[in-house]
Interface confidence: low
C-alpha cells in the first residue's frame, strides 16, 4: 500500500539547457521518526530511478552523475538536484520512499521539469580603455552558471595577440595586447557546456586607442585630379596665382587632431589652420616654403611636411625688372 504526499511549491519548474535546478521535496510530517528506508526519484513512466541513495539500485545512464538525491531525513529533505540540464530531461518526475521493513511506501505528487533553450549569453568585461601595445585583461563571465555543474569550456577567438589568464568555474581571463590593426576587429568568447552539449557566445568589437601611424597630404590644384603625398616632400612646383587645397589625413583612435603650420613648427607654435584642410586661394611669394600638417594624439603625434616651390608667370614679372 502506498501513501501519497504532496510536493511543496510549484507544479512545474523551468531550467535552461546546461544549467542546474533544484526540485524541492520535503518528506511528509506524518512519517514516523523510526521509518528507515531509501528514497528514489523516478521519471514518470519509467521504473528505473533517475536518482537514489540505495546502493543496490542502478540509476538511468542518462541521468547518472547529473541527478542527485539530496537525502537528509532528519531535516525531512528529499530534494532532487539536476545539473547540466539536457533537453531530454524535459519530463515529469516523482519521489518514492520505500522501506524493506515496512508494509507501505510514500509516493509524492508529480512535478514537471521544463528544459528550455539557453538564452543567457556570456558577458565580456573590459577594464577601461584598450591601448595599443599595452596588455589588458578581458574577462568572459557566466555568472548564471551553477557551481555544481560541469565546468564550462571557455574559448576565445581574436586576431589580436593574446594569452590565457586564470579561470574559474564562472569566468575566464584573456590578456590581450592589441595593435593598431586590431581596432574594430571582433573578439569572441564562446562558452561550451560539455554536460549538455550547448554552446553560447558573445562577440564584441575591439575599440583600440592608438597614436597615428600614418599621415598623408592630398593636394588639389585647380581642377586637376588630386594626388597624395605619404612622406615628407622636398618641393612641389605650383604656378603663381593658382588655388591650392591641401587636405591632411591621419589614422589613430580616437581621431587625431589635425592642424596646419607654416614652416617647421615648434611644439607650442600657432597653427594657420585648426582643421585638416588648408585653403590657399592664390599662391604667391608668401606661400613659398614649407607647410606642415601635425596629427596630435594623446598617445603620440606625427607630422608630415610639404615644400611649395612657386613658378612665376612671365607676364607677372615683366613690369618689375
Amino acid at each position: 500500500q502506498e501513501r501519497r504526499f504532496q510536493l511543496e511549491g510549484p507544479e512545474s519548474l523551468t531550467v535552461q539547457e546546461g544549467l542546474c535546478v533544484l526540485v524541492p521535496c520535503r518528506l511528509p510530517t506524518t512519517l514516523p521518526a523510526s521509518y528507515y528506508g531509501y528514497g528514489y526519484w523516478f521519471l514518470e513512466g519509467a521504473d528505473v530511478p533517475v536518482a537514489t541513495n540505495d546502493p543496490d539500485e542502478e540509476v538511468q545512464e542518462e541521468t547518472r552523475g547529473r541527478f542527485h538525491l539530496l537525502w537528509d531525513p532528519r531535516r525531512k529533505n528529499c530534494s532532487l538536484s539536476i545539473r547540466d540540464a539536457r533537453r531530454r530531461d524535459n519530463a515529469a518526475y516523482f519521489f518514492r520512499l520505500k522501506s524493506k521493513w515496512m508494509k507501505y511506501g510514500y509516493t509524492s505528487s508529480k512535478l514537471s521539469v521544463r528544459v528550455m533553450a539557453l538564452t543567457h549569453r556570456p558577458n565580456i568585461s573590459i577594464p577601461g580603455t584598450l591601448e595599443s601595445g599595452h596588455p589588458s585583461n578581458l574577462t568572459c563571465s557566466v555568472p548564471w552558471v551553477c557551481e555544481q555543474g560541469t565546468p564550462p569550456i571557455f574559448s576565445w577567438m581574436s586576431a589580436a595577440p593574446t594569452s590565457l589568464g586564470p579561470r574559474t568555474t564562472q569566468s575566464s581571463v584573456l590578456t590581450i595586447t592589441p595593435r593598431p590593426q586590431d581596432h574594430s576587429t571582433n573578439l569572441t568568447c564562446q562558452v561550451t557546456f560539455p554536460g549538455a552539449g550547448v554552446t553560447m557566445e558573445r562577440t564584441i568589437q575591439l575599440n583600440v586607442s592608438y597614436a597615428p601611424q600614418k599621415v598623408a597630404i592630398s593636394i588639389f590644384q585647380g581642377n586637376s585630379a588630386a594626388f597624395k603625398i605619404l612622406q615628407n616632400t622636398s618641393s612641389l612646383p605650383v604656378l603663381e596665382g593658382q588655388a591650392l587645397r591641401l587636405l591632411c589625413d591621419a589614422d589613430g583612435n580616437p581621431p587625431a587632431h589635425l592642424s596646419w603650420f607654416q614652416g617647421f613648427p615648434a611644439l607650442n607654435a600657432t597653427p594657420i589652420s585648426n582643421t585638416g584642410v588648408l585653403e590657399l586661394p592664390q599662391v604667391g611669394s608668401a606661400e613659398e616654403g614649407d607647410f606642415t600638417c601635425r596629427a596630435q594624439h594623446p598617445l603620440g603625434s606625427l607630422q608630415i611636411s610639404l615644400s611649395l616651390f612657386v613658378h612665376w608667370k612671365p607676364e607677372g614679372r615683366a613690369g618689375g625688372v
Epitope: 539536457r86 533537453r87 531530454r88 565546468p151 569550456i153 571557455f154 574559448s155 576565445w156 577567438m157 590565457l164 569572441t188 564562446q190 561550451t192 560539455p194 549538455a196 552539449g197 554552446t199 557566445e201 562577440t203
Partner: antibody
Framework: QVQLQQPGAELVKPGASVKLSCKAS????????IHWVKQRPGQGLEWIGM????????NYNEKLKIKATLTVDKSSSTAYMQLSSLTSEDSAVYYC??????????????WGTGTTVTVSS | QIVLSQSPAILSASPGEKVTMTCRAS?????MNWYQQKPGSSPKPWIY???NLASGVPARFSGSGSGTPYSLTISRVEAEDAATYYC?????????FGSGTKLEIK
Amino acid sequence: QVQLQQPGAELVKPGASVKLSCKASGYTFTNYYIHWVKQRPGQGLEWIGMIHPISGSTNYNEKLKIKATLTVDKSSSTAYMQLSSLTSEDSAVYYCARRYYGSSYWYFDVWGTGTTVTVSS
Amino acid sequence: QIVLSQSPAILSASPGEKVTMTCRASSSVSYMNWYQQKPGSSPKPWIYATSNLASGVPARFSGSGSGTPYSLTISRVEAEDAATYYCQQWSSHPPTFGSGTKLEIK
C-alpha cells in the same frame, strides 16, 4: 592554409591498441575543438567525441566511449585518439575535424586527411 | 540520439537534370548540415545551417527544410557532382550523420 594532417594507415593486431595523431596547422589550435569521426568501409560517418585543446575536457559518444581515449598536446598542436582492444569492427577510416562556430549553428569546416586502421592478424 | 535517414540511398541522374535528396530526422532538429565525399577523400563541408553554401560550392546547389525533413537540391547536375552526400545534425547531442545518398551521373 588550415590543415589537419593525419598518418595514412595503421595495421594492428586484434586485441591491441593504436594511437592516432592529428596535427593542426594554419590556425590557432587552442581556439577550436578537435572532433573524431569514424567511417567503416562503404558506410556512413559516426561521431566519436571531441576534445578542447585548452582544458583537455572531453565529451564522448556514449556508444563508443569505452573504445576511444582523446588527448591533446598543445605544444605541438596535435590531437590524439587511442583506440583499445581492437577488433575487426574497428577497421575503419578515422578522421579528425575542426568545428566552425556560428552564432546558432555548428558544422565541421575542416577535415583531416584520415587514417585507415586495419585490424588483422 | 537522433537518427537521420537519407533517401534515396542511390540517385542516378543525367547531366543538366534537377535532383533532390532528402534527410529525415527521428525528431525535430533546428538545422541541417551537408557534406560531400568522393571515393578516397575526406568529407567536405557543402551546405551548413540548412541553406548556406560552404566556400567554393557552386550556386547550383541549394538546401532547405525545417524541423524535418531537410533536402539538398542540385538545379542542373554536372559530372563533377558525382559523390556521396551526408546530412548531419547537432541540435541534439551527440551529433549524428545520415547514411548518405550516392549520386551517380549517367
